[in-house]
Interface confidence: low
């Protein structure tokens, strides 16, 4: 019978050897068999599973001139960069006729310096704030014991005696480096060195100190910054746009913020050029030589109303006997709030000043006291908001009414001859 066709007679004359080495090693496993007739294809098994994508080469050498003579077949499996997944039991497998033959096993083992699965990463942390770092290594050989180092100083008395996969750091006051050493029977591997940059803590207690229609004075409490003094703090203000929805944790304002820098101390800043009677959101961050803190949450604030910045415009005052008709237009200057109305004052040369609240109307007919013979009568008008009166207009003299001049009908306003309070005459 041809060689290799009997169940008890294995065609294999050379079985895979053993390879044990460190990660990255390149090695070759070899199988040799002698068969009669056409050489079969040699398959490789790892732990009983056929390797579909094996990096193998097969060499066939005839031992005679006839095809039916014996052949020597050599299959070589190349392991290019040894990894944990390559380890296991390797065998060659051939199909001869209706029979399957498997070689004796060879073994591939991994043994070397520890290999890091996870290494500490660079990060920024706020001063005196706890955080964790991770490090994970494996053999073989096991066990692998870790030793953490801070600024190159071991944090435990011996490998395996300190924190292992996770290092809890209660807080730092200076930028520090951390690494971990992995120890096993073959030696020591050192991880990458992670730089932990210590930034200032987030400022606290951002609050308003004082409010003006166009400026806000704010203050805050600085957070700890470790050994690094704060160089400055940055304050941002953004228009709230009627509850435009800056939530406490929303990362960015919806529009370009107004940004101001404050040298510190003091931890206080006057924000100017704001709109009166307007809601804003503000936040602050402080910076050291190591970088900026995180921003505080957005704080809603509002500038107060101001008084109108200018007097009413285009005031005209005409007189017809004992009646005077006065009308005006809204100030062109900013109102700095909600216009609540107008005040009007009139006075003759030798008579006391009369002060009236006109409300939101922009015209009034005055019933003058006496026979209308008061001379040199002048009128002033001021607009007012909840914050108070704006500037009074310059005195406008009452002009005599000339026939042909329009005289609209107005509600007559009778005022007492003595004012309830005196108003400064501008």
């Amino acid at each position: 019978a041809p060689r290799g066709t009997q169940a008890e007679e294995s065609p294999f004359v050379g079985n895979p050897g053993n390879i044990t080495g460190a990660r990255g090693l390149t090695g070759t496993l070899r199988c040799q068999l002698q068969v009669q007739g056409e050489p079969p294809e040699v398959h490789w098994l790892r732990d009983g599973q056929i390797l579909e994508l094996a990096d193998s080469t097969q060499t066939q050498v005839p031992l005679g001139e006839d095809e039916q003579d014996d052949w020597i077949v050599v299959s070589q499996l190349r392991i290019t960069s040894l990894q944990l997944s390559d380890t296991g039991q390797y065998q060659c497998l051939v199909f001869l006729g209706h029979q399957t033959f498997v070689s004796q096993p060879g073994y591939v083992g991994l043994e070397g310096l520890p290999y890091f699965l996870e290494e500490p990463e660079d990060r920024t942390v706020a001063a005196n704030t706890p955080f964790n770092l991770s490090c994970q290594a494996q053999g073989p050989p096991e066990p692998v014991d870790l030793l953490w180092l801070q600024d190159a100083v071991p944090l435990a008395t011996a490998p395996g005696h300190g924190p292992q996969r996770s290092l809890h750091v209660p807080g730092l006051n200076k930028t520090s480096s951390f690494s971990c050493e992995a120890h096993n029977a073959k030696g020591v591997t050192t991880s990458r060195t992670a730089t932990i940059t210590v930034l200032p803590q987030q400022p606290r207690n951002l609050h308003l100190v004082s409010r003006q229609p166009t400026e806000l004075e704010v203050a805050w409490t600085p957070g700890l910054s470790g050994i690094y003094p704060l160089t400055h703090c940055t304050l941002q203000a953004v228009l709230s746009d009627d509850g435009m929805g800056i939530q406490a944790g929303e990362p960015d304002p919806p529009e370009e913020p107004l940004t101001s820098q404050a040298s510190v101390p003091p931890h206080q800043l006057r924000l100017g050029s704001l709109h009166p009677h307007t809601p804003y959101h503000i936040r602050v961050a402080c910076t050291s030589s190591q970088g900026p803190s995180s921003w505080t949450h957005w704080l809603p604030v509002e500038t107060p109303e101001g008084v109108p910045l200018g007097p009413p415009e285009n005031i005209s005052a005409t007189r017809n006997g004992s009646q005077a008709f006065v009308h005006w237009q809204e100030p062109r200057a900013p109102l700095q709030g909600t216009l609540l109305g107008y005040r009007l004052a009139y006075q003759g040369q030798d008579t006391p000043e009369v002060l009236m609240d006109i409300g939101l109307r922009q015209e009034v007919t005055l019933e003058l006291q006496g026979d209308g013979s008061v001379s040199n009568l002048t009128v002033c008008v001021a607009a007012y908001t909840a914050a108070g009166d704006g500037p009074w207009s310059l005195p406008v003299p009452l002009e005599a009414w000339r026939p042909g001049q329009a005289q609209p009908v107005h509600q007559l306003v009778k005022e007492p001859s003595t004012p309830a309070f005196s108003w400064p005459w501008w």
């Epitope: 706890p130 096991e142 066990p143 692998v144 014991d145 008395t157 011996a158 490998p159 395996g160 005696h161 300190g162 924190p163 292992q164 996969r165 809890h168 209660p170 807080g171």
Partner: antibody
């Protein structure tokens, strides 16, 4: 639920040995240290030593050096503390406790040493 | 070995009181300090680790502070279930050592 279940109370004669077990469940056994702490009646807490269940490495308090052995069996997630040459002053409750800071404790094992 | 000295050894207080316990290390231990609560017949319970970090599930009336050699445990408003013995413990270097304990009793 993370649990440390300790073996039952023991009564021993002076000079004998005692082996207390602590079986962990509800977490990855090899990822956390285990400590042994004891407390004599009416006294404070006393740290005895630590074992790293991953590698099996140990460190013992000087006071117990030579008398204490801490071991672990990863297949059953159990650590053991054996104290030999027992004397009456070793009568105490023995606790196992997990992690660098002792975040989970066993219920304790009472060991009484009496002639 | 690092010695841990706790004071006072006992304190009498009423429900609602603010209680402060101090712990001093014989040498600097950075923030490697824990506080435990123990009730009679029970295992200790971790309250504070890393000097000031509150263990999960522990009420916020417990707080820790300090660094280096001097540490404080504060109970802001004592509750009936807080009457117990409290221990500090350093985790800076072997052997780990405990303070002698402070018993908080009902006044």
């Amino acid at each position: 639920e993370v649990q440390l279940v300790q073996s039952g109370a023991e009564v021993k004669k002076p000079g004998a040995s005692v082996k207390v077990s602590c079986k962990a469940s509800g977490y990855t056994f090899t990822s956390y240290y285990m400590h042994w702490v004891r407390q004599a009646p009416g006294q404070g807490l006393e740290w005895m030593g630590i074992i790293n269940p991953s590698g099996g490495s140990t460190s013992y308090a000087q006071k117990f050096q030579g008398r204490v052995t801490m071991t672990r069996d990863t297949s059953t997630s159990t650590v053991y503390m054996e104290l030999s040459s027992l004397r009456s002053e070793d009568s105490a409750v023995y606790y196992c406790a997990r992690d660098w800071y002792f975040d989970v404790w066993g219920a304790g094992t009472t060991v009484t040493v009496s002639a | 070995n690092i010695q841990m000295t706790q004071s006072p050894s006992s304190v009498s207080a009423s429900v609602g009181d603010r209680v402060t316990i101090t712990c001093r290390a014989s040498q600097g231990i950075s923030s490697w300090l824990a506080w435990y609560q123990q009730k009679p017949g029970k295992a200790p319970k971790l309250l504070i680790y890393a000097a000031s970090s509150l263990q999960s599930g522990v009420p916020s009336r417990f707080s820790g502070s300090g660094s280096g050699t001097d540490f404080t445990l504060t109970i802001s408003s004592l509750q009936p279930e807080d009457f117990a013995t409290y221990y500090c413990q350093q985790a800076n270097s072997f052997p780990f050592t405990f303070g002698g304990g402070t018993k908080v009793e009902i006044k």
